[in-house]
């Protein structure tokens, strides 16, 4: 008789990434008998929740349930019913909620309470909703990309099965850009991590890793833009802000109350003689770059070297995966290719920012104007952050790999978070076993 496959023995996990600008739900799947193997967990679904981040629901918490419904119901469809009760669900909130908590711990708790109540209504094994720290966000992003790239596997291969694989066990650094924060995480070369807050020690699959990480709150792309506007309006002579980070001909009215709503602009807050001002784009990359640099305080460093704002940063080492908004923005600008030098990226940004707004709108007719209008700023901000903030150079630029997915799984902190919480990354290398014989009878 012919061998026939047994029903697959798989497990699932769900992680919700409650970011500052939106929430995404990820569903992961893995073979049950290979939980401790490296690289076996993969993403089977991403569901982007329609609407803004959960922190925006602070005055309408009773709507959080309906906001999450479509994606939670999607999870119910994707995961077989027999697996529902044993499928863990985790929600991690990032910098948007960190900012809300800074303003009011009570309001942040209220949002999380309603989130927990909503998620508890589903047939899954809900494990809690919490605000993860910036350090965790950096660490889990680093774990995710190295897990997916096979860097924790002790088996060396003569062939490459994943992109960017260099067949050595040197880990990749992780560069994550969100709306409200940005993280840099990597293993420095024989370098003491001079500030304990930035040091992580892991033992993964029998190997020790001393990892540097830092999360810069308020330096995600959206909050960086609010900071820049708040800084620039201080010196505007009237309610017109001629802004080099927006295309020539672009106009937009901004409410001062919106500008000062975030804790990120507190340091620039002042009494203005108007309630609204108008941004008028002038589209000049160089001037935009200069304006962004003023957000980075590089005049003070209590360590051997710093990134900015007095934060220790060891010398950069090895290759880096740049994901989340680093990838989305550069992908839109068509600048993710490994062949594009930093000089070429700068050149392309100069041209892009100088293009008239009417021309841009025609060229990208399908893109929402709010997003479209901010790519000049975001692209320029990414260059400024990587070059002046983190000290990448024209030479080391080629070590940055803009990554959206690896092996079909999104690069980001969620996979690493689930691997950790489900104890799927052992400290010690599992004993190698012969090929499983349980698949066929």
């Amino acid at each position: 008789t012919q061998n026939k496959a047994l029903p697959e023995n798989v497990k699932y996990g769900i992680v919700l990434d409650a970011g500052s600008s939106h929430t995404s739900l990820y569903i992961y799947k893995w073979p049950a008998e290979k939980e401790n193997d490296t690289g076996v967990v993969h993403q089977v679904e991403e569901c982007r929740v329609k609407g803004p981040g959960i922190s925006k629901f602070v005055q309408k918490v009773n709507e959080i349930g309906i906001y999450l419904t479509d994606c939670m119901e999607r999870a119910r469809e994707v995961i077989p019913r027999s697996q529902h009760q044993e499928t863990p669900v985790y929600l991690g909130a990032t910098a948007g909620m960190r900012l809300l908590r800074m303003e009011s711990e009570e309001l942040a708790d209220r949002v999380l309470d309603v989130v927990e109540r909503s998620l508890s209504n589903y047939p899954f094994d809900f494990q809690g909703a919490r605000i993860i720290t910036g350090q965790e966000e950096g660490a889990y992003g680093w774990i995710t990309i190295n897990y997916l790239l096979g860097k924790f596997s002790q088996k060396t291969r003569w062939f490459s099965i994943v992109p960017y694989e260099t067949n050595n066990q040197e880990t990749f650094g992780a560069l994550d850009l969100g709306g409200a924060s940005t993280q840099v995480t990597f293993v420095p070369q024989n370098q003491t991590i001079e500030s304990p807050d930035n040091a992580l020690q892991f033992r993964l699959y029998g190997k020790d890793y001393n990892v540097y990480t830092h999360s810069f709150l308020c330096y995600g792309k959206d909050q960086a833009l609010w900071q820049k506007l708040a800084k620039d309006i201080q010196v505007a002579s009237n309610e017109i802000l001629r802004d080099p980070c927006f295309h020539p001909g672009y106009k937009k009215v901004v409410n001062v109350s919106d500008l000062y709503k975030t804790p990120c602009t507190k340091r620039f807050e002042m009494t203005l003689p108007f309630q609204q001002f108008e941004i008028q784009g002038i589209g000049n990359y160089q001037q935009c770059h200069q304006s962004i640099l003023e957000l980075f305080n590089t005049s003070y460093c209590p360590y051997s070297q710093c990134a900015f704002n007095g934060i220790f940063l060891p010398p950069l080492q090895g290759d880096f995966g740049a994901f989340s908004a680093f990838y989305f923005v550069m992908k839109f600008l068509n600048l993710t290719s490994e062949k594009v030098s930093q000089e070429k990226v700068t050149e392309m940004m100069k041209k892009f920012c100088a293009q008239p707004w009417e021309e841009i709108k025609t060229s990208y007719a399908g893109v929402k104007e709010k997003y479209l209008s901010e790519y000049c700023f975001s692209g320029t901000y990414i260059l400024s952050l990587l070059l002046q903030g983190y000290h990448f150079t024209a030479d080391s630029w080629e070590h940055i790999h803009f990554i959206g997915k690896i092996q079909g799984s999104d690069a980001g902190w969620t996979l690493g978070y689930m691997l950790n919480l489900t104890n799927m990354i052992p400290a010690e290398q599992p004993l190698s076993t012969p090929l499983s014989h349980s698949t066929y009878v």
């Epitope: 500052s20 600008s21 939106h22 329609k50 609407g51 803004p52 981040g53 925006k56 629901f57 005055q59 309408k60 709507e63 309906i66 906001y67 419904t69 479509d70 119901e73 948007g96 709306g179 959206d222 901004v254 409410n255 919106d258 929402k368 709010k370």
Partner: nanobody
Framework: QVQLQESGGGLVQTGRSLRLSCAAS????????MGWYRQAPGNERELVAA???????NYADSVKGRFTISRDNAKNTVYLQMNSLKPEDTAVYYC??????????????????WGQGTQVTVSS
């Protein structure tokens, strides 16, 4: 613009049922969420039940198991079937159609349309 017209309210005894209807007209392709809010005298307006464009639903704890929201896309109408009514369900019931903004600035809702309301009174 979207116009919403409620019907089906009235006076009913405890334990009985009512079915509210909300007919939508106008530019409704921009709407993902529809729902029913209610407001009793001296109270804030509260969300009772909501339904998404995909037909998924959500209910306030106080009405779970008693009320059912449904949507007939062909007729552009949303219904609220209210069973086992209680005196505390007495309120003006408003139909609401909305969609959320994706942006971190400005209001939470990009579109927000309301009906005039229909009175539901549950007598003991």
């Amino acid at each position: 613009q979207v116009q919403l017209q409620e019907s089906g309210g009235g006076l009913v005894q405890t334990g009985r049922s009512l079915r509210l209807s909300c007919a939508a007209s106008g530019d409704i392709f921009s709407i993902n969420y529809m729902g029913w809010y209610r407001q009793a005298p001296g109270n804030e307006r509260e969300l009772v039940a909501a339904i998404t464009g995909r037909g998924n639903t959500n209910y306030a704890d106080s009405v779970k198991g008693r009320f059912t929201i449904s949507r007939d896309n062909a007729k552009n109408t949303v219904y609220l079937q209210m069973n086992s009514l209680k005196p505390e369900d007495t309120a003006v019931y408003y139909c609401n159609a909305w969609d959320y903004s994706d942006y971190d600035e400005g209001p939470l809702r990009e579109y927000d349309y309301w009906g005039q309301g229909t009175q539901v009174t549950v007598s003991s």
